[in-house]
């Protein structure tokens, strides 16, 4: 399987809400011993490998934000914890999954990574991620609503299986 990032850049005004999206592509194993986790975390540019470093989103770790199920199933975080931080992650039956961030501040700017992890027999881990940039702007140059920039075709299937 692969992860596609439809948009590589989101430019938003302060105070706005944004939904970052990724899509799980390709066949997924629906075996009884396979679990899929979909989650989000922050990272930084300038590394050898994008998304290799991980940091929390608004103090929430990837485990606080994850959805887990078998393959292309719908789910969303009902965690009070995430919602208290103005965050909600969700996924649908078509492999799309997202994180919504409410009331953006300049501190939310940075690199965001979506991640799909396949676990077999509750141990071995296979993972694929996608990356996108969020720029939160303030002042007269800020857009009135979020503007999204599509990924180039080679970025949009951001296959970084580890």
């Amino acid at each position: 399987f692969k992860v596609a990032t439809p948009y590589s850049l989101y430019v938003c005004p302060e105070g706005q809400n944004v939904t970052l999206t990724c899509r799980l592509l390709g066949p997924v194993d629906k075996g009884h011993d396979v679990t899929f986790y979909k989650t989000w975390y922050r990272s930084s540019r300038g590394e050898v490998q994008t998304c290799s470093e991980r940091r929390p989103i608004r103090n929430l770790t990837f485990q606080d934000l994850h959805l887990h199920h078998g393959g292309h199933q719908a789910a969303n975080t009902s965690h009070d914890l995430a919602q208290r931080h103005g965050l909600e992650s969700a996924s649908d039956h078509h492999g799309n999954f997202s994180i919504t961030m409410r009331n953006l501040t300049l501190l939310d700017s940075g690199l965001y990574c979506c991640l799909v992890v396949e676990i077999r027999h509750h141990h071995s881990e296979h993972r694929v991620h996608g990356a996108m940039e969020l720029q939160v702007q303030t002042g007269k140059d800020a857009p009135s609503n979020c503007v999204v920039y599509p990924s180039s075709s080679q970025d949009s299937e951001n296959i970084t299986a580890a």
């Epitope: 990837f62 141990h123 296979h126």
Partner: antibody
Framework: QVQLVQSGAEVKKPGASVKVSCKAS????????INWVRQAPGQGLEWIAR????????YYNEKFKDRATLTVDKSTSTAYMELSSLRSEDTAVYYC??????????????WGQGTTVTVSS | NIMMTQSPATLSVSPGERATLSCKSS????????????LAWYQQKPGQSPRLLIY???TRESGVPDRFSGSGSGTEFTLTISSLQSEDFAVYYC????????FGGGTKVEIK
């Protein structure tokens, strides 16, 4: 840079407990598992347990699940391993090590310098 | 539990020579989904903590000299040091991370 710094050597009597600390720096402590591995004199490496600091959830090697307790203090980015009911065969160097997994298992990319625990009457 | 067996226990090699270390697992550590071998190698010098050399059986950790190479798949793995330097004399451990964590007993590489 990413670093794990452990507490100093300990000498304990049989039956006592020991608590070893591991202070992390240079990365987001809450987002990476901390493992504990021991090495008896002249012996190989043996995995004891690991903990995810973000949640405090710990996972133990069956051999140690009744005697080892892992905890973290997020405010100081410090992980702890307490081993109870010590016996002479627990004499070893105890290492903390970071692994890069999300939900499964992974290799250990960063190690502490080790803490020598001696159990002797 | 997956058992890891390393051989030989001690390897005597002269500086500049090639060293070949073996590691065998009791079951395959190859993961079918990504065709990766969940095997790492560490170097440990006396009085020091282990240092990651190789992961995924053959990927060198950054900063590790290219005289170190890993190979093998499934249950049989090899760590090769192409031309031993004085700083390479140490104990080497293999480690599987497919199913929990287990280590081999180690191979000590000593000066001949």
């Amino acid at each position: 840079q990413v670093q794990l710094v452990q507490s100093g050597a300990e000498v304990k009597k049989p039956g006592a407990s020991v608590k070893v600390s591991c202070k992390a720096s240079g990365y987001s402590f809450t987002d990476y598992y901390i493992n504990w591995v021991r090495q008896a004199p002249g012996q190989g490496l043996e995995w004891i347990a690991r903990i995810f600091p973000g949640s405090g959830n710990a996972y133990y090697n069956e051999k140690f699940k009744d005697r080892a307790t892992l905890t973290v203090d997020k405010s100081t980015s410090t992980a702890y391993m307490e081993l109870s009911s010590l016996r002479s065969e627990d004499t070893a160097v105890y290492y903390c090590a970071r692994d890069d997994s999300f939900y499964g298992y992974w290799y250990f990319d960063v190690w502490g310098q080790g803490t020598t625990v001696t159990v002797s009457s | 539990n997956i058992m890891m067996t390393q051989s030989p226990a001690t390897l005597s090699v002269s500086p500049g020579e090639r060293a070949t270390l073996s590691c065998k697992s009791s079951q395959s550590v190859l993961y079918s989904s990504n065709q990766k071998n969940y095997l790492a190698w560490y170097q440990q010098k006396p009085g020091q903590s282990p240092r990651l050399l190789i992961y995924w059986a053959s990927t060198r950790e950054s900063g590790v000299p290219d005289r170190f190479s890993g190979s093998g798949s499934g249950t049989e793995f090899t760590l090769t040091i192409s031309s031993l330097q004085s700083e390479d004399f140490a104990v080497y451990y293999c480690h599987q991370y497919l199913s929990s964590y287990t280590f081999g007993g180690g191979t000590k590489v000593e000066i001949k």
